[in-house]
Interface confidence: low
């Protein structure tokens, strides 16, 4: 069962992460959630500029999701349809982040309680989509560009969406084999 994200770092408002939200619940292919220029939301099989997202804590366990390239917020209509909005509407665009034990997260509209799902793609019906809420694995994106001395790597920010935010346990076991390379 999903459990609320209890990472202490999420208690602080304004905590920002750059992530790709990867899911293998898509009917046809694995995908990254992508917010496009025209406001549509879909899946990108491979990481793309449109799939780099900024996750910002609004309050404990509740986040907003912003497309870094398109400057559009991920929002959800009452019927569950997703869209990208240039304006942040707290009711439509706030998501509760629930941490699963395998490193994946589930996101639910805070207002409607509807789970976040990528729009279904064109799998034949004999390749059905799994039932239940979609599971997303937050994969690290590049942190916001900061001037760094040449030859020095900027440390990765802690993954506050993880049960091991400071990477003390070791590599995540939740990553899909598709992205193990």
């Amino acid at each position: 069962h999903p459990i609320p994200d209890s990472s202490p770092l999420l208690q602080f408002g304004g905590q920002v992460r750059q992530r790709y939200l990867y899911t293998d619940d898509a009917q046809q292919t694995e995908a990254h959630l992508e917010i496009r220029e025209d406001g549509t939301v879909g899946g990108a099989a491979d990481q793309s500029p449109e799939s780099l997202l900024q996750l910002k804590a609004l309050k404990p366990g509740v986040i907003q999701i912003l497309g870094v390239k398109t400057s559009r917020f991920l929002c959800q209509r009452p019927d569950g349809a997703l869209y990208g909005s240039l304006h942040f509407d707290p009711e439509a665009c706030s998501f509760r982040e629930l941490l699963l034990e395998d490193g994946y997260n589930v996101y639910q509209s805070e207002a409607h309680g509807l789970p976040l799902h990528l729009p279904g793609n064109k799998s034949p019906h004999r390749d059905p989509a799994p039932r239940g809420p979609a599971r997303f694995l937050p994969l690290p994106g590049l942190p916001p560009a900061l001037p760094e001395p040449p030859g020095i790597l900027a440390p990765q920010p802690p993954d506050v969406g993880s049960s091991d935010p400071l990477s003390m346990v070791g590599p995540s076991q939740g990553r899909s084999p598709s992205y193990a390379s």
Epitope: Q28, T29, G42, A45, K122, P124, D127, P177, S181
Partner: antibody, heavy 117, light 112 residues
Framework: QVQLIQSGPGLVQPSQSLSITCTVS????????IHWVRQSPGKGLEWLGM???????DYNAAFMSRLSITKDNSKSQVFFKMNSLQADDTAIYYC???????????WGQGTLVTVSA | DVLMTQTPLSLPVSLGDQASISCRSS???????????LEWYLQKPGQSPKLLIY???NRFSGVPDRFSGSGSGTDFTLKISRVEAEDLGVYYC?????????FGGGTKLEIK
């Protein structure tokens, strides 16, 4: 880095079968579909069939009776077999990986198959 | 099967000109999920085709914005606003809504 590497014979005798293996790296066959497409010399592209991530297949009806597509996820290999080849099956045969909203994102290098005695 | 008919067969252009390629399907190519899987590919000599446009009008990652796709129903168009030398090759439309998936016959974009 995503790669699809094809291996198979370049010359096939008429009425014989063609077997090509597409070995993939940089992704898992449990997550993506693989298509097979051919291009006859100086001609256009022809979709032959595909294998979904589940292992289910779809074939072009024109080839269904003599075409088989299978895979081994653990070896990251997809197997293409076409029987009863004739001269007009001479073509470059490609494997290609799908995307989420589109079909052919990554391609194999192509296998030029000549059907001749 | 869905027949995809491209016109023209050959399109001579001058660099910097606009180019327009038409693709007509023999039936409506709306998938049963409501989307239209109409794609455009460019193939250069000795290479495999490269994806340009998907779902009628979405540019694939890295494709210059001089490429645009439009259309609906059975009529679709690929436009190149200012042709550059690297755009020369054979363009194919493709429908991935109904099995068997089918390609158009191709349009060769060449220098006038």
């Amino acid at each position: 880095q995503v790669q699809l590497i094809q291996s198979g014979p370049g010359l096939v005798q008429p009425s014989q079968s063609l077997s090509i293996t597409c070995t993939v790296s940089g992704f898992s066959l449990t997550g993506y579909a693989i298509h097979w497409v051919r291009q006859s010399p100086g001609k256009g592209l022809e979709w032959l069939g595909m294998i979904w991530k589940s292992g289910n297949t779809d074939y072009n009806a024109a080839f269904m009776s003599r075409l088989s597509i299978t895979k081994d996820n653990s070896k990251s290999q997809v197997f293409f077999k076409m029987n009863s080849l004739q001269a007009d099956d001479t073509a470059i045969y490609y494997c290609a990986r799908n995307g989420y909203d589109y079909e052919f994102v990554y391609w194999g290098q192509g296998t030029l198959v000549t059907v001749s005695a | 099967d869905v027949l995809m008919t491209q016109t023209p067969l050959s399109l001579p252009v001058s660099l910097g000109d606009q180019a327009s390629i038409s693709c007509r399907s023999s039936q409506i190519i709306v998938h049963n999920n409501g989307d239209t899987y109409l794609e455009w590919y460019l193939q250069k000599p000795g290479q495999s085709p490269k994806l340009l446009i998907y779902k009628i009008s979405n540019r694939f990652s890295g494709v210059p914005d001089r490429f645009s796709g439009s259309g609906s129903g059975t009529d679709f168009t690929l436009k190149i606003s200012r042709v550059e030398a690297e755009d020369l090759g054979v363009y194919y439309c493709f429908q991935g809504s109904h099995v068997p998936y089918t390609f158009g016959g191709g349009t060769k974009l060449e220098i006038k």
